[in-house]
């Protein structure tokens, strides 16, 4: 048993039929010694008396909020949560496996630049009785500080008949140098509690591997005289690291017809302009990627040819 | 994805082209190592990230762009020099700061070159003949070192008398390639910055 936060404890249980469970001793937080009784949740059934209560925790029926009372007055509470381990594997019932980039990916993280700021998100089909807390550090043996905000519900999506809820959190490395070469990964730990069930999820990554620039901005077309060609120009996104001559981007310019089946013309360039042929009803899209370290491409920025 | 090959203008900062070739060569070599050594721990997640230049050179700090010198987190490790202007020891007189940056890059290349050559000698003795270092990568390191135009003592190639442990050598190769790729990215950023200065 260990303390998750004040008055909230996690009991780790091997989960199999007829498992012996864990013996837990609860102590009433009071100077009183006599006349103390214990109850569980809203039930008025007295479970025991005395300053300590010993219970055998085997299943969810044994978890919940234990309260010690004296003469009708509440003295203290202890909330017991269960963390299930089946066949040596901790349960992952609360979050949805996003399966990208590989199976058993519950947390996904992205950074718009090298400032040490990043966003992580996760999915669940659970809508209520759900709390998350997020901690992060650089490295694990001698951890350096990363500060994370509160996890918030960032999107709701309908998937077939069911709703999916996306939660996200923003974190910032306390002292990040954008030019640094990372040798220790960022560790992100998410504690998830659904009713009386506790689970934890972790992700480990280098900022350089989760970079995804914002799309290029101010995408403009300038027709070239007496030609079907246009000059496409754009700018680095505002959120990208500076100086741009050090943190350079490379770009992909795509001309796409109305129909998805039409052949796409693609040009790669390190410049912030390109000359392409603009077909009728087509659109021109540009996306960006770190020029020197091939992490993710940005989303497309698009303009219609007309 | 292959980076587009830049054809440098004659007056262009001479090292940029070489640094781009270096990054391309090390990225290709790393990809080849990952594929060939698929049953070895060779991915970024699996390996220990070691830097053989640690405490010997200070490339990141010495080559820090002027704009980042206001960032205290970039200056915390040691007294830092930063690059201001200049070209790759071309005709103009290069500033002291600049020289420090470029000589640090040169020292990195020299250390990696020695490590890679030593390792290649071991890999050539492997009866499995599973993987060797790409001669192109070694050549590109050499070209960039020549373009940097520093004269420094040649480091003798390490020779080892004991029987090589080929498993450990291959894992060390992965560690080295990952670290060298990261350093090659930094070198490319620096050259790009200098080219724009």
């Amino acid at each position: 048993i260990w303390e998750l936060k004040k008055d909230v404890y996690v009991v780790e249980l091997d989960w199999y039929p007829d498992a012996p469970g864990e013996m837990v001793v609860l102590t009433c937080d009071t100077p009183e010694e006599d006349g103390i009784t214990w109850t569980l949740d809203q039930s008025s059934e007295v479970l025991g008396s005395g300053k300590t209560l010993t219970i055998q925790v085997k299943e969810f029926g044994d978890a919940g909020q234990y309260t010690c009372h004296k003469g009708g007055e509440v003295l203290s509470h202890s909330l017991l949560l269960l963390h299930k381990k089946e066949d040596g594997i901790w349960s992952t019932d609360i979050l949805k496996d996003q399966k990208e980039p590989k199976n058993k990916t519950f947390l996904r993280c992205e950074a718009k630049n090298y400032s040490g700021r990043f966003t992580c998100w996760w999915l669940t089909t659970i809508s209520t009785d759900l709390t998350f807390s997020v901690k992060s550090s650089r490295g694990s043996s001698d951890p350096q500080g990363v500060t994370c905000g509160a996890a918030t519900l960032s999107a709701e999506r309908v998937r077939g008949d069911n709703k999916e809820y996306e939660y996200s959190v923003e974190c910032q490395e306390d002292s990040a140098c954008p030019a640094a070469e990372e040798s220790l990964p960022i560790e992100v730990m998410v504690d998830a509690v659904h009713k009386l069930k506790y689970e934890n999820y972790t992700s480990s990554f280098f900022i350089r591997d989760i970079i995804k620039p914002d799309p290029p901005k101010n995408l403009q077309l300038k027709p070239l005289k007496n030609s079907r060609q246009v000059e496409v120009s754009w700018e680095y996104p505002d959120t990208w690291s500076t100086p741009h001559s050090y943190f350079s981007l490379t770009f992909c310019v795509q001309v796409q017809g109305k129909s998805k089946r039409e052949k796409k013309d693609r040009v790669f360039t390190d410049k912030t302009s390109a000359t392409v042929i603009c077909r009728k009803n087509a659109s021109i899209s540009v996306r960006a990627q770190d020029r020197y370290y091939s992490s993710s491409w940005s989303e497309w920025a698009s303009v219609p040819c007309s | 994805r292959n980076l587009p090959v830049a054809t440098p203008d004659p007056g262009m900062f001479p090292c940029l082209h070489h640094s781009q070739n270096l990054l391309r060569a090390v990225s290709n070599m790393l990809q080849k190592a990952r594929q060939t050594l698929e049953f070895y721990p060779c991915t970024s997640e699996e390996i220990d990230h070691e830097d053989i230049t640690k405490d010997k050179t200070s490339t990141v700090e010495a080559c820090l762009p002027l704009e980042l010198t206001k960032n205290e987190s970039c200056l915390n490790s040691r007294e830092t020099s930063f690059i201001t202007n200049g070209s790759c020891l071309a005709s103009r007189k290069t500033s002291f700061m600049m020289a420090l940056c470029l000589s640090s890059i040169y020292e990195d290349l020299k250390m990696y070159q020695v490590e890679f050559k030593t390792m290649n000698a071991k890999l050539l003795m492997d009866p499995k003949r599973q993987i060797f270092l790409d001669q192109n990568m070694l050549a590109v390191i050499d070209e960039l070192m020549q373009a940097l135009n520093f004269n420094s003592e040649t480091v003798p190639q390490k020779s080892s008398l004991e029987e090589p442990d080929f498993y450990k050598t291959k894992i060390k190769l992965c560690i080295l390639l990952h670290a060298f790729r990261i350093r090659a990215v930094t070198i490319d950023r620096v050259m790009s910055y200098l080219n724009a200065s």
Epitope: D41, Q42, G64, Q65, T128, D161, K197 | -
Partner: antibody, heavy 117, light 107 residues
Framework: QVQLQQSGAELMKPGASVKISCKAT????????IEWVKQRPGHGLEWIGD????????NYNEKFKDKATFTADTSFNTAYMQLSSLTSEDSAVYYC??????????WGQGTTLTVSS | SIVMTQTPKFLLVSAGDRVTITCKAS??????VAWYQQKSGQSPKLLIY???NRYTGVPDRFTGSGYGTDFTFTISTVQPEDLAVYFC?????????FGSGTKLEIK
């Protein structure tokens, strides 16, 4: 002893609104969700939604989003459900119940609503 | 929303019989399933929570099992006082949904 006491039966005209109350005793009212459930003969039990009195946080079943409004008064340990624009479809028994971790563990006795012109 | 398909709708049994009711969720609800008993003219009463845990004071002839999508409620030896309608419910995610109910009648 936990108890939920609901307001009495109501006979309402179509188009009108009604407010059903649920007074809780015997536990910390602010810490437990109050659930509202509808039961019509032949339609089984339908969850309308819930309110956490301490924070005022609510969840509504999409189906009842424009029909029901939940409020709670922690000084009187009472939760309320207002049903608006009543039609004959709203004629049913409405229950309040408490929920923390173990399903709907305590139920009120039910309030019968009849909507008839 | 999650559909809880409860079978059978009716059960005609004799005292002492063993009774099994099943509930199938349209998607995984982990173990967040409760079973209720509703006697004629009364409010529902909680019998089982977290799929297999008996609520305080519930006789041990009532048991529940299951995980994910398939759940079972069993009365090992039916007593005359068990005449009632039994409902399953998922409280995994909102909207919380109930099964259609199983009416237990004693011969």
């Amino acid at each position: 002893q936990v108890q939920l006491q609901q307001s009495g039966a109501e006979l309402m005209k179509p188009g009108a609104s009604v407010k059903i109350s649920c007074k809780a005793t015997g536990y910390t009212f602010s810490s437990y969700w109050i659930e509202w459930v509808k039961q019509r003969p032949g339609h089984g039990l339908e969850w309308i939604g819930d309110i956490l009195p301490g924070s005022g946080s609510t969840n509504y079943n999409e189906k009842f989003k424009d029909k029901a409004t939940f409020t709670a008064d922690t000084s009187f340990n009472t939760a309320y459900m207002q049903l608006s624009s009543l039609t004959s479809e709203d004629s049913a028994v409405y229950y309040c119940a408490t929920r923390r971790f173990r399903g709907l563990d305590y139920w009120g006795q039910g309030t019968t609503l009849t909507v008839s012109s | 929303s999650i559909v809880m398909t409860q079978t059978p709708k009716f059960l005609l049994v004799s005292a002492g019989d063993r009774v099994t009711i099943t509930c199938k969720a349209s998607q995984s609800v982990s173990n967040d399933v409760a079973w209720y008993q509703q006697k004629s003219g009364q409010s529902p009463k909680l019998l089982i929570y977290y799929a297999s845990n008996r609520y305080t004071g519930v006789p041990d002839r009532f048991t529940g099992s299951g995980y994910g999508t398939d759940f079972t409620f069993t009365i090992s030896t039916v007593q005359p006082e068990d005449l009632a309608v039994y409902f399953c419910q998922q409280d995994y995610t909102s909207p919380f949904t109930f099964g259609s109910g199983t009416k237990l009648e004693i011969k």
